[in-house]
Structure formats: C-alpha cells, structure tokens
Amino acid sequence: SGTTNTVAAYNLTWKSTNFKTILEWEPKPVNQVYTVQISTKSGDWKSKCFYTTDTECDLTDEIVKDVKQTYLARVFSYPAGNVESTGSAGEPLYENSPEFTPYLETNLGQPTIQSFEQVGTKVNVTVEDERTLVRRNNTFLSLRDVFGKDLIYTLYYWKDSSTGRKTNTTHTNEFLIDVEKGVSYCFFAQAVIPSRTVNRKSTDSPVECMGQEKGEFRE
C-alpha cells in the first residue's frame, strides 16, 4: 500500500560501536526522502534526520540518554518534493527497526595498548580506557565508567620468538605479567563482556612488542 512512487525502507540495521550508533537501511532513494523516528518502549517518538536522501541516521544523541533502555526506530518514506503526501491508509509508508539495547548490544571498539613498562621480571601493561559519547554531569564517560565490572580485558602474550601464547584477564585496565629477563615479548588485548550473549568480544588491539617506543624498561 502507499503511493505508487515511494517504497518502504528495508534491511533496517543498527551499527553501534562504543555507543556511537547509526541506523542504516535500504534502498538508495529514487524520487523519495526519508525521516527517522526513535522511541523507547514506553516513550514518545522523536523525529531525526528529516527528509534526508541518506540511508543512514546517527541516533547516538538519543540512545546515550539511557544506554540501558531498549529502543525502536522506524523509517518513513515520502515522495521527493511532496512530503505531505501519504499512503492509502492516510499515513506515509514506514518500516520498523529491530529493537536495540545499547548496553547489551553495542560493539566493543578495538582496544589500544596505551603503555607497557618492564621492571625486572614483571611487565605492567595498560589498556587505554576509551572515551564514549555517553555523558554524565557534562563529562564524557569512558568504557569502564559505563560498564564497570561487566567489562574485563584479556591479554594475550608470547615470547617474540615463540608461537606459544599465554593469557591473563583483569577487571581493571592493567595487567602485571611475569616475563623472563632479557627476553622480548609481544602482546595484544581484547575487551570482553562475559555476561553478554551477543557481541561479547572486541576485535584484537594492534600487537605491541617490547623494544618499541611505547615501552619503558627499568632494572
């Protein structure tokens, strides 16, 4: 149903990393434009990305208001140049998105190893606490601020010349691993939310090896 020269959006997909959240859809518009609405289950609809020819809409500003809420979006299709026109049922064509709960579903961004410092046979490895777009009291919260103990990090490390990998986990952003003196090690980190059923792990951080500029060495 609807006007003959508009088609409903389809393949509505949430793309979200560290709470930066964009709704994408198809098709590329031909003689039509789109408006997006977003709502919590119990809230009112709020319109965004008015009469756009894009096939994506940044909804970050809305979802960061409460990342533990469940959100639903819908995409309306209008004829280009005649946005007052409606479908046969008296309203424009629209399609609903899947539900989206940012806290449970946003992808964990690729972590970065901020620094490593060797003191004797121990190496302190620090993973950067990435900033998110979630605000509290006018400051942006870090990933740790938002997830608290739900977020852990896993460190994979190995002797530079070896293939055997070891792992450690931490509830902070720091590791303190045992190494052999005079031996170079490489490592990468991964963010993990063990309690999740989807999107539990981030991609791996870039590999860092001892002897590179991020490291410090003390006897």
Partner: antibody
Framework: QVQLQESGPGLVKPSQTLSLTCTVS?????????WSWIRQHPGKGLEWIGE???????RYNPSLKSRVTISVDTSKNQFSLKLSSVTAADTAVYYC??????????????????WGKGTTVTVSS | EIVLTQSPGTLSLSPGERATLSCRAS???????LAWYQQKPGQAPRLLIY???TRQTGIPDRFSGSGSGTDFTLTISRLEPEDFAVYYC?????????FGGGTKVEIK
Amino acid sequence: QVQLQESGPGLVKPSQTLSLTCTVSGGSISSGQYWSWIRQHPGKGLEWIGEIYYSGSTRYNPSLKSRVTISVDTSKNQFSLKLSSVTAADTAVYYCARDAPYYYGGGYYYYMDVWGKGTTVTVSS
Amino acid sequence: EIVLTQSPGTLSLSPGERATLSCRASESVDSSYLAWYQQKPGQAPRLLIYGASTRQTGIPDRFSGSGSGTDFTLTISRLEPEDFAVYYCQQAGVVPYTFGGGTKVEIK
C-alpha cells in the same frame, strides 16, 4: 586510611522505603574502587545487595533488583542505598564496603577489603 | 546463582589445634574470585584471603587458603585465642556475589 560510616534511620515502617548513606573518609570515592552494600539478617549469613562505581555504573542482586537503588554523590564522597516496599524480612544489619582491586595471577580482581561498622535497621510498625 | 556450602557448621577446637574449614560451590568458581572473611561478634567481616590462596596484608601466616573449581579450604595451622570467630567464603565472579553460610570456630 579509608574508613566507611553508615547512617540512616534504625526503624522503618513496613511498605516504606529504607534509606541509608555511607560516607567515605580518608580517600576519594572516585579513585577506581567499587562501593558495595551487604546485609546480615539476625543470626544469619551475609547477603550482597549491590555495588556502584563512581560513574554511576551499578550491579544488583537479582533477588532484590526490583526494590533496590544504589546511587553515588562524588561531591559529598558518599553513596546511598534505597530499598523500597520493605517488610519484616528486611530487618538486618546493613554494611557498606569498599571493593578494591588486588593483583592476582597477572590481572587485578576486586575484593571487599574495608567495611563500615554496620547499622541495624528494624522494619516494624 | 552460585551456592556456597560451608562445612562444618560449627568447629569446636582448643587453642593450638589445627582448623580446617571447607567451602563447596554449586558450580565451578574461578580461583581469582574466591575470598575468605572472618567475623567476630558485633563486628564487620574482615578480608583474610583473596584469590583462594593469597593472604591479605597484615593477616598472620597461620591462615592459608587452597583449592580450585568447586572445592576450597581455609586452614588455620595453630589456633590463637583471637581466631575464634565465624568464617565465610565468598565468590565475586558471578552476579549475585554470594557468601557461604559460615563456619563458627568455637573454643572447646
């Protein structure tokens, strides 16, 4: 040295809301620890209620989650517990505690290492 | 939730004797998350052991912890008068964090 002190009414009427505050002294509430509430029913064991990070991130015991709110006030170095719709079964000693990171096996894990003295709350009309 | 069962409920011993307290979990607990606490009457619990086997700063070496998986043990090698108290194991790996029911170590 960090010290914790619970405060709040010792008597609450059934169906009302229990409100307690824990004041942190000798350290900052924003220094990377978590802050917990635990209770102990008379002559019984310990029950974890929930915890909060300075940012406001919380975790609750699912058995109490529908009635519990834990909040933090970094400007006052305090965190608080609210437990709604109380009954006689909520009569207990309520403790606040610091959950601090300790090195273990290559990483850091959290343990409740500093506790308040506890405050007795009786639910009765 | 993970249920921690402590045994025995009460242990009657004399000063100088060895105390062995057991904590059994309903499912496997990562040692990293297992702690032991001591509580005396009218006082708050005190952290003794974390990571199943590491003594907290200031805790005498007569206290030791061991175990993995579902079976953990707290041992007091020679009981001192101040050791008579209730001891709780706790897991902090899975929400809700849970405590065992406690073992009371009393003077025989």
